[in-house]
Amino acid sequence: MAVTACQGLGFVVSLIGIAGIIAATCMDQWSTQDLYNNPVTAVFNYQGLWRSCVRESSGFTECRGYFTLLGLPAMLQAVRALMIVGIVLGAIGLLVSIFALKCIRIGSMEDSAKANMTLTSGIMFIVSGLCAIAGVSVFANMLVTNFWMSTANMYTGMGGMVQTVQTRYTFGAALFVGWVAGGLTLIGGVMMCIACRGLAPEETNYKAVSYHASGHSVAYKPGGFKASTGFGSNTKNKKIYDGGARTEDEVQSYPSKHDYV
């Protein structure tokens, strides 16, 4: 039961996290005009990964997409890439984890396969979360650098060109959404990996095993390390965790082809 709960919770947390990463990537408010200690304007500027917007006090909002690829800063391109990689990995992870869920039975899929899938999806969620956190952090660092540069030089002018008040940008809502979403995806991934550890030993956690060796019978309940007799498929020493109290997961035990030798 604990394994199922951990796996299910990990899936849900990751799902929320990935939804958040998608939302953050699509949001326009990655950077917003800094209003502190600035002349108060009737126009509010904010920028996203894909377009920049201007909202007038009347409520009129105009957004313009970045229709160039080569003209964009390399850092912005890197952030875009990180967020997209995060989304793709997260989406694949979600797909894999659906089939890995213990509560969903697909054909005669063994627990070992589900354990592997759980681990795979968990790793994917961890990498996805890290990508999102990295992307948002890179953008935040870029903002901080630009903020202090524009603070040092509030007014810029080039040659005979018009002097323009440099608009300073600060952290937008999307950054916080991205950080939280990345963190949730990461946590969900870790939970999936933990759930995998609980799933993996179950294939060898037998209720009763009968060994016929050297003419005499040895029947025992597993506990501690299982003796390696060279029979069956269990040739490796595996620690069987048996706390005495049985969970619901352990109640239903179907005989496998290796149960009897």
Partner: antibody
């Protein structure tokens, strides 16, 4: 059609208060911002204050301490509360609707005259 | 506060001839986000309320004759009347529509010679 009608003007003694009203029709005050602009006799236009559709307000810094802009959404009416009036506040007071684009003022009322005199 | 300076104070014109009014702001009215200049032009005809002519420095308000055109960027702006008509007389005002408080220029009185 869009119409703005100012009222409440008149002769008032220095130091006294006065409340101007601006009845709007043809649009909602919760959709468009409305400004107050004044014009002293024979002088140019002077921006007084604005209340935006969302309810936020901005003032002429020189008048902020004495003037308050407000509105009654149910009556679709705008108000300008003027306290501690001075002789230099004598002017025609216009209310004007904020254009949806460019922060301009696209519709103006006919104005109401306020005379501050002892 | 932003200071708006208009010139000339008075502009006598001949009907059918072009006219030009200048407006300078103490700070740029150009918004870097959308590359638009938040400068507005108004005309106040004698005995009337002002009317909006141009916003965003160069975009004509609907219903305004196309003989009126606005140009300029940053701090220097110009209103041009390609062919002045008798009905164009009045006082022209430019307005800062970017920084609070919004401020108007002193006005330019256009009159027929």
């Amino acid at each position: 059609q869009v119409q703005l009608v100012e009222s409440g003007g008149g002769v008032v003694q220095p130091g006294r208060s006065l409340r101007l009203s601006c009845a709007a029709s043809g649009f909602s005050l919760t959709t468009y911002g409305v400004h107050w602009v004044r014009q002293a006799p024979g002088k140019g236009l002077e921006w007084v204050a604005v209340i935006w559709a969302g309810g936020s307000t901005n003032y002429n810094s020189a008048l902020m301490s004495r003037f308050t802009i407000s509105r009654d959404n149910s009556k679709n009416t705008l108000y300008l509360q003027m306290n501690s009036l001075r002789a230099e506040d004598t002017a025609v007071y216009y209310c004007a609707r904020a254009a949806y684009y460019g922060n301009g003022l696209d519709y103006w009322g006919q104005g109401t005259m306020v005379t501050v005199s002892s | 506060d932003i200071v708006m300076t208009q010139s000339p104070l008075s502009l006598p014109v001949t009907p059918g001839e072009p006219a030009s009014i200048s407006c300078k702001s103490s700070q740029t009215l150009l918004n870097s986000g959308n590359q638009k200049n938040y400068l507005t032009w108004y005309l106040q005809k004698p005995g009337q309320s002002p009317q909006l002519l141009i916003y965003w420095a160069s975009t004509g308000e609907s219903g305004v004759p196309d003989r009126f055109s606005g140009s300029g960027s940053g701090t220097d702006f110009t209103l041009k009347i390609s062919r002045v008509e008798a009905e164009d007389v009045g006082v022209y005002y430019c307005q800062n529509a970017y920084f609070y408080p919004f401020t108007f220029g002193g006005g330019t009185k256009v009159e027929i010679k």
